[in-house]
Structures are given as C-alpha cells and as structure tokens.
C-alpha cells in the first residue's frame, strides 16, 4: 500500500522522498526565507480501509511572511496552552491541551497567519465528558465574557469576565461550572471606575472636573514663588484592579543664584547660593578711599528675586556699579629731565592715572618709577630724577680735597678744597656734583700768597712748621747763594718764607 | 486511577548516554501531554519539555535541546527520555508528570540518573 | 524566559501561626500553581490556577495574586505541612521558582 505524490507547496520545498511511498512514510515541508509555514510540517502517509494509502492531514502552505502580523490571545474553553507564548507573529503556533474530562475537536495546533487570524483551521473546541452542563450566562453591562456565544457550557468549563474601558469588575472575575451544573458564583458587574479627590496640593493648587471617571484630567498650577515639576496635568486611569491618577508634579521653590558682587561695593541681605523667591538685597558702595573722591552708586540700590519666562529664579535687574566722582581732578602733564615716560602718555590726566618713567642711557632713576594722578591733582609720589654719579673730583696742585676717601660721588656730593700755607685759593672753595655727572663750579687754584711779615725772622729753619721755599731766588753777576733766613709771614696758620742770602 | 511508573535508577560513565522510561495507566496514553522534569540533588525543579503520544510531536526547553530526546510507545503506553553526552551536571532525579488541567497533576516516583567514571 | 523568585527561602513557624511564601515573576503571567514536596518524594500539586486547591488539600491553605506577584498562605501551621513549596508558572519554557523550605519549629 502506498501513497500518491504529496500534495504541493507554493513558495515551499517538500522533503526528499523515494517512490513508492510506503504506509508510515512522514514527509516535511519547509518554506523559502521570506515566507512562513502555516500548519503542519509533516505529513504520515497512512491506510483507512487497508487498501488505498491517503496523506493524514492536508498540506501546510506557506505565506509571504508580514512583519506587522500579530494575533490576539487564543483561548479554548475546557483546554489550556501547551506550546507558544504571546507575543504571537506571524507563523507562531499555538497547540493546545484539553482539561481531565474534556475531549477535544479539531486539531490541537493553530498559526498565527498574515491576516492577523489563527488558522489553517479553527481553534480547537474541548468537549465535556459529562452530561450536565450549566445554563448560558447573561451579558453584563459594560463588560464581557468568555462564552458569550456558546449556548450552554460543560462542568469544568470557566468563564473570565471583563469589563469595558473605564470600568471596573466588582465580584468574581473567574466563574467554574461545577459538575452540578450550577455556576460557581453569581456573575460580577462593571461599574464606572473613579478616581479619588486629588485633594490638597502643596504649594499650589489642582483644578479637577466634578466627576473624576477615567480619562478625565486633572490640572496643576503652583502658588507665586513655585514652580511645576513633572507634567502639569495628571488623567484618571484604569490600574490594574483599580483606578489611579497618572504621574502628578510636585511644586518646588523657586531659587535664584547667589546675588552678584560689584565691584568697590557690597550687598545686604541675602548672599546664599539659593536665595528664595521675593527675598530683597540692597548694594551700597564701599567708603570714600581719598579725601575729595568718593564712590557713587550707578542704577537700582535694590534687587528683587522674581523669576522669567521659563519660571526659572533671576534678580530684577542688572547690580548697580560704584563709580568714583573724579571728573574734575586734573593733574599736570609730568615731565622728567634726562628720562621718558614710558607708558600712561595721555592728553589729559585724570584721577587715579599712572604714568611709568625710564632714564636715558648711562642715567640712574631716582624715585618711584611710577606715579599716581591723586584726588588733589597732584603726582604721588613725586616724579622721579634721571641722574649720573660724578669721577672722583680732581686733586689741585699745593692743596687738598675734603673728600673723606669716598668711592661714590653721587649727584648732590659737596666737595670742599683748601691750599697750604702760602697759597690763596682762586675759585670757589666748595663744588658740587650736578646731576648730569659733572662738577660745578670749576674746581679752583691755589696760587702763591704775599708774605705779610710779622718782623720775626729765624736763622735756622722752623721744625714743625710750613716753610715755602725759595725756588726762584738767584744772585747778581759776582755773587753766589750762600745760607738763608726765615721769615714769619702772618696767616690762618703761621708760615714761614725762606730768602736765600748772597755773598761776595 | 492515573498511574506513572518509572525505571529504576541509573550508574552511568561520563560520556556514554541513558535511557529511561515512564509507564503510564489509567488514562487515554495518547490524548495527554507527557512532561519530563530535572531535580538536582537539593535544587530546584527544571521542565525538560513535553511529547504529546498521539502524534509523537514535541516541544524541549532550548537549554536541553541536544541533551535529551523524548519518544513514545502507543502500544505500551510508555514514554521514554534518553539523555546523551552525559557529564557530572546530569546527575539529578528526572520525573515524568502528566498535565491533565494545565498543571503537573500526576507525577512519577523519579528516577535517580548518577554519571560517574 | 520568565524568572520565578520565591521568598523567602527558608523559614521556620511554630504549630498555629500564619505562614506566607511569595513568589515575584519576572514578567506578568495570568496563573500561578504551586507544589508541595516532602524529603524523598514527588513533588504533589498543591494549589493550581492561583486560588484553586488540589485534591486533598487542607483549607487552611489558600492561593492569591495577580500579574507580577502571587503568595500561598496557611492560615494555621500544622507539622504536617512542613515541606519545601515550589511555584511554577505556565508560559514557554516552564518554569519554576527555587522553592521556600517550611520547618516546624
């Protein structure tokens, strides 16, 4: 006994098979990659009357496969699920079991096809073995059941009630039909599910429609100095056994940033980084620094914390300024000799301007190298001087410096000179160091001094005593130099004079 | 009444492969789903998968798929599992149950599976 | 596949007190069936469908829950109920929780 040739497949394979086909044969259909097998994949060929084989089942087929296929849920009274599992798309199966005391007709496995229904064939039925079955159960308002097209239905069997959307099940969900053939309770009723009062909302307010059914919504307004955070309404929904509202806000306080500082000034008030909603801070300026200047506030004294467009905490306004009142303070254009100014060079020289000086070359700064234009007009501290050390002043023939050994000679340095006894000093006596490095007066002379004699002469020369010798001194023709004679002339320190003698 | 009699237990070497079975009674063999269930020593409860007898389909958890093969015999009405490649982590006591109203409400007295060389 | 944890996992109750296992699934499933099982045994079906009592079993014995979380409450311990209690659930692949050992004190 065999089998004819397996029915075909459109869009599909059929596994490889010799021929005849001998009773017990199983053959396997398989579908090309963008389709999906709808039903049985293998087929047994078997004999009814022991004479003619025939293939047990027909042939499965394949569909284009849809990706946006979903079925619902399948359920089979009396039976339960033994294979698949939701989500179910397209070419899922879905086999089922029938409960103790149930028979089942139809096939066991249903697929999930393109058209978002369950086939090839209807979902199995699970039959009761028992005789007594329990009466039809009534529709209820605004909901549902399970057996709402079935007549009278089996002991074993359940019915799952639900309710429409926005109502809720009071009672049983699940009722059994027990082997008396009587329900296992009355059935449920639905009934308008609604939200609790919002009630109270802190720092703010709610506004709610007089009956809160589902779907209604609730709407959230903050009281001033709030804010809404999260959504600023919530809707009544259905939760699970119950009804609830969605996500509701929260009212937080509004802050703004720490008030901001100014300079030559300070604020009052309230200097924390988060400075609450209405809260005042006042600037004032700093003290006068100087005598004749002193710091005026430029724009609002006061701030407010309020808050902008997008309910965010800002100050009212921009902080003030403090400005010095210094627009009549002018100060001489400043001038250094042998030096220039480097940096701050302007027309016009106004309160608190500086100017830098550097000296020519060679030149040494003497004072601050920087000055101030003061509240009274003048430079601080006084300009700077560009001077040059003067050389060691010179030595001067029969006299003598007072220069105590220095080394320095800076601009200013007095030097005194004297002449020995004898000699008178031509010149200044003192000269000093100019600041261009050069000493003035001309530096004098000591030039021989007449002898005011005092009528003392010595024979022998004085010890201890200046004694100007005689260097010119020279004897006429039949003479010759021959010992001398000192004579006392008057001065600050006595001197003596030495006069050469002639003799024959 | 419902009644499922397993095999005795098992001493196997690692490696080799065992096959035990689960003879059943009072009930339509072919009309009910025949569940096998893992129990390591002191563990939890692992669902193997299922054979349905009337037409020999099947369905495994994917963890066992390789590791056992489940089959029926109509004319005995027993359902055997045969579990391959055994290592150390098949040692455990393996049930057959039967869901007659969508949960394991018939179950066999287990057969204690021990893989050591 | 769904993830069945069962707290807690061991527990000890004194003969008349009320006992509660819980069994927390990791994604809503519409029944719970739990078994009991003594050392040496077959697990038994205990309670099946969430609140529907096996055959034989005592009614200080009672099953609720819904979605995510389901529990088995005894109203009254009696030494004989102490055993370990295992919760499955009935989506592919099967699973089952890890079980709640109940000792008597």
């Known amino acids: 006994i065999s089998c004819g040739s397996p029915p075909p497949i459109l869009n599909g394979r059929i596994s490889y098979y010799s021929t005849p086909i001998a009773v017990g044969t199983v053959i396997r259909y398989s579908c090309s990659g963008t389709f999906r097998l709808i039903g049985e994949k293998s087929l047994l060929c078997i004999t009814k009357d022991k004479v003619d084989g025939t293939w047990d089942k027909p042939a499965p087929k394949c569909e284009y496969f849809n990706k946006y296929s979903s079925c619902p849920e399948p359920i089979v009274p009396g039976g339960y699920k033994i294979r698949g599992s939701t989500p179910y798309r397209h070419g899922d199966s879905v086999t089922f079991a029938c409960k103790t005391n149930f028979s089942m007709n139809g096939n066991k496995s249903v697929w999930c096809q393109a058209n978002n229904m369950w086939g090839p064939t209807r979902l199995p039925t699970c039959v009761s073995v028992f005789p007594l079955e329990c009466p039809a159960l009534p529709m209820i308002h605004n909901g549902h059941h399970t057996s709402e097209n079935v007549g009278s239905i089996a002991p074993g069997l359940s019915v799952t009630y639900s309710c429409e959307s926005g109502y809720l099940l009071v009672g049983e969900k699940i009722i059994n039909c027990l082997s008396s053939g009587k329900w296992s309770a009355v059935p449920p009723t639905c009934e308008e599910a609604r939200c609790k009062s919002l009630g109270r909302f802190p720092n703010g307010k709610v506004k709610e429609p007089p009956i809160l059914r589902v779907g209604v919504t609730a709407n959230f307004f903050c009281d001033e100095g709030y804010r809404l955070q999260g959504p600023p309404s919530s809707r009544c929904v259905i939760a699970g056994q119950g009804v609830a509202w969605t996500k509701m806000p929260v009212c937080e306080e509004i802050f703004c940033p720490s008030p901001p500082p100014i300079l030559n000034g300070r604020h009052i008030g309230n200097s924390l980084a988060n400075v609450s909603y209405g809260s005042i801070v006042t600037y004032t300026c700093d003290p006068d620094p100087e005598e004749g200047v002193n710091f005026i506030l430029i724009g609002e004294s006061t701030l407010r914390c309020t808050v902008d467009s997008q309910k965010t905490g800002t100050w009212s306004g921009p902080a003030p300024r403090c400005e010095l009142s210094t627009s009549a303070v002018q100060c001489p254009h400043p001038q250094i000799l042998r030096g220039r100014m480097v940096s701050g060079q302007k027309d016009r020289y106004t309160y608190n301007d500086t100017v830098i000086f550097a000296c020519m070359f060679g030149f040494t700064l003497k004072g601050s190298k920087q000055i101030r234009c003061n509240a009274q007009g003048t430079w601080e501290p006084s300009a700077p001087v560009c001077e040059k050390e003067c050389q060691a002043p010179p030595n001067i023939l029969n006299g003598q410096k007072e220069d105590r050994h220095m080394v320095r000679f800076d601009p200013g340095t007095s030097i005194k000179y004297s002449c020995n006894p004898g000699y008178v000093l031509v010149g200044e006596e003192s000269i000093q160091c100019t600041s261009e490095g050069v000493w003035t007066p001309p530096v004098p002379q000591c030039k021989v001094a007449a002898c005011e004699a005092t009528g003392r002469q010595l024979l022998t020369k004085p010890q201890h005593q200046f004694v100007r010798p005689d260097v010119n001194s020279s004897c006429g023709e039949g003479y010759k130099l021959s010992g001398s004679v000192y004579q006392e002339c008057q001065g600050t320190i006595p001197w003596f004079m030495e006069i050469r003698l002639c003799k024959e | 009444e419902v009644h499922l009699q397993q095999s005795g237990a098992e001493l196997v070497k690692p490696g080799s492969s065992v096959k035990i079975s689960c003879k059943a009674s009072?009930?339509?063999?072919?009309?009910?789903?025949m569940h096998w269930i893992k129990q390591q020593p002191g563990n939890g409860l692992e669902w193997i998968g299922w054979i349905y007898p009337g037409d020999g389909d099947t369905e495994y958890n994917q963890k066992f798929n390789g590791k056992a093969s489940l089959t029926a015999d109509k004319s005995s009405s027993t359902a055997y599992m045969q579990l391959s490649s055994l290592t150390s982590e098949d040692s455990a006591v393996y049930f057959c149950a039967l869901s007659g109203d969508g949960y394991f409400d018939y179950w066999g007295q287990g057969v204690m599976v021990t893989v050591s060389s | 596949e769904i993830v069945l944890t069962q707290s807690p996992t061991t527990m000890t109750a004194s003969p008349g007190e009320k006992v509660t296992i819980t069994c927390r699934v990791s994604?809503?499933?519409?029944?719970m069936h739990w078994y009991q099982q003594k050392p040496d045994a077959s697990p038994k079906p205990w309670i099946y469908?969430?609140?529907k009592l096996a055959s034989g079993v005592p009614d200080r014995f009672s099953g609720s829950g819904s979605g995510t979380s389901y529990s088995l409450t005894i109203n009254n311990m009696e030494a004989e109920d102490a055993a370990t209690y295992y919760c499955?659930?009935?989506?592919?692949?099967?699973?089952f929780g890890s079980g709640t050992k109940l000792e008597i004190k």
């Open positions: 469908e969430t609140s």
């Open positions: 009072g009930y339509t063999f072919t009309s009910n789903f």
């Open positions: 499955q659930q009935w989506n592919f692949p099967l699973t």
């Open positions: 994604s809503s499933v519409s029944y």
